[in-house]
């Protein structure tokens, strides 16, 4: 089953996907597509990298992280409701049946119209945009979207999630990345 990520209309959505290159600059092809991962490649490709560079991308889809270090997380700019759905991140690792395939579900919510109080903006500076647990690869990464819209109940929930993610770090040995080589 797909792990769910959320964003609001008009925001940028973030879909995490990582691997660790065997050596610096020793990259493997990666593709992102709209739709679940098929046998070959990605369906409806929106972005692709090769062994050297990003060699194909479409408007609004880009890699914000350092893909040369294996951060191939996808950013979708200014999302609309039509961007909802399953996205495939495929890391094309050489070898027998080595490809890593991740299906990520993006849920787009209608934009809130109420302005965010000052107190919530203060909270944004104190917490990162993304909570990452060192679990089973990208499937364990949760994005919080735009934090200024968070309410006090959610702040409590976030504190619990931060605590849980630290606990997860203690409990899980496997990294949040795919290691190659």
């Amino acid at each position: 089953s797909e792990v769910e990520y959320r964003a609001e209309v008009g925001q940028n959505a973030y879909l995490p996907c990582f691997y660790t290159p065997a050596a610096p600059g020793n990259l493997v092809p990666v593709c992102w597509g709209k739709g679940a991962c098929p046998v070959f490649e990605c369906g409806n490709v929106v972005l692709r990298t090769d062994e050297r560079d990003v060699n194909y991308w479409t408007s609004r889809y880009w890699l914000n992280g350092d893909f040369r270090k294996g951060d191939v997380s996808l950013t979708i700019e200014n999302v609309t409701l039509a961007d909802s759905g399953i996205y495939c991140c495929r890391i094309q690792i050489p070898g027998i049946m080595n490809d890593e395939k991740f299906n990520l579900k993006l849920v787009i919510k209608p934009a809130k119209v109420t302005p965010a109080p000052t107190r919530q903006r203060d909270f944004t500076a104190a917490f990162p945009r993304m909570l990452t647990t060192r679990g089973h690869g990208p499937a364990e990464t949760q994005t919080l979207g735009s934090l200024p819209d968070i309410n006090l109940t959610q702040i409590s929930t976030l504190a619990n999630e931060l605590r849980d993610s630290r606990l997860a770090n203690d409990l899980r040995d496997s990294g949040a990345t795919i290691r190659i080589g």
Partner: antibody, heavy 123, light 107 residues
């Protein structure tokens, strides 16, 4: 246009290794987007996908054949090959090599097949 | 593995008639379904990919539809050269699997 041609012995003895080569012309075997595949068709029967090796070196084998199967690429000769060990009469089939090519813009699977070669397993 | 079931096994029609071939998957294959045509002594030829997109050079009388588990290949008006065996194929899950084929024969 890419063309593919299978070559190898038409008769293999039981328990031996079936070896086939597919020669690619009209394109480079190492070019991006290509998935080099082997498919077989038992006489009068349907199609069975054996496995593929991608331009990036990813290899996928049909689980039913995985323990006996090796697919590899020789870029210097622009060829890829199939080795199937410990064959029995059940491996008698027409063997096709093929490529699926995923266009970088559309993801379209251009589909090219060889004409096929019949391999009979018999003593 | 995903099992692909085609029906009917044999379809007998005359040139000019409409042919409807069905393919059902044992689990969802999204739209990752292709249709192939095979004539005796020849390799299969791709007709339709991703359930409904016609491959290059395929006449407009061939069309595909469906998603999930149920798919249809329609030939709007049969030409003499269309009589052959037709296979559906899924590329959603490994291993790639084919249906057992539908033989389209002249009535």
């Amino acid at each position: 246009q890419v063309t593919l041609k299978e070559s190898g012995p038409g008769l293999v003895k039981p328990s031996q290794t079936l070896s086939l080569t597919c020669t690619v012309s009209g394109g480079s075997i190492s070019s991006g987007g290509h998935y080099w595949s082997w498919i077989r068709q038992h006489p009068g029967k349907g199609l069975e996908w054996i496995g593929y090796i991608s331009y990036s070196g990813s290899t996928y084998y049909n689980p039913s054949l995985k323990s006996r199967l090796t697919i590899s690429v020789d870029t210097s000769k622009n060829q890829f090959s199939l080795k199937l060990s410990s064959v029995t009469a059940a491996d008698t089939a027409v063997y096709y090599c093929a490529t699926a090519y995923y266009d970088i813009l559309t993801g379209y699977p251009f589909d090219y097949w060889g004409q096929g070669t019949l391999v009979t397993v018999s003593s | 593995e995903i099992v692909m079931t085609q029906s009917p096994a044999t379809l007998s029609l005359s040139p000019g008639e409409r042919a409807t071939l069905s393919c059902r998957a044992s689990q969802s294959v999204s739209s990752y379904l292709a249709w192939y045509q095979q004539k005796p002594g020849q390799a299969p030829r791709l007709l339709i990919y991703d359930a409904s997109d016609r491959a290059t050079g395929i006449p407009a009388r061939f069309s595909g539809s469906g998603s999930g588990t149920d798919f249809t290949l329609t030939i709007s008006s049969l030409e003499p050269e269309d009589f052959a065996v037709y296979y559906c194929q899924q590329r959603s899950n490994w291993p790639i699997t084919f249906g057992q084929g539908t033989r389209l024969e002249i009535k």
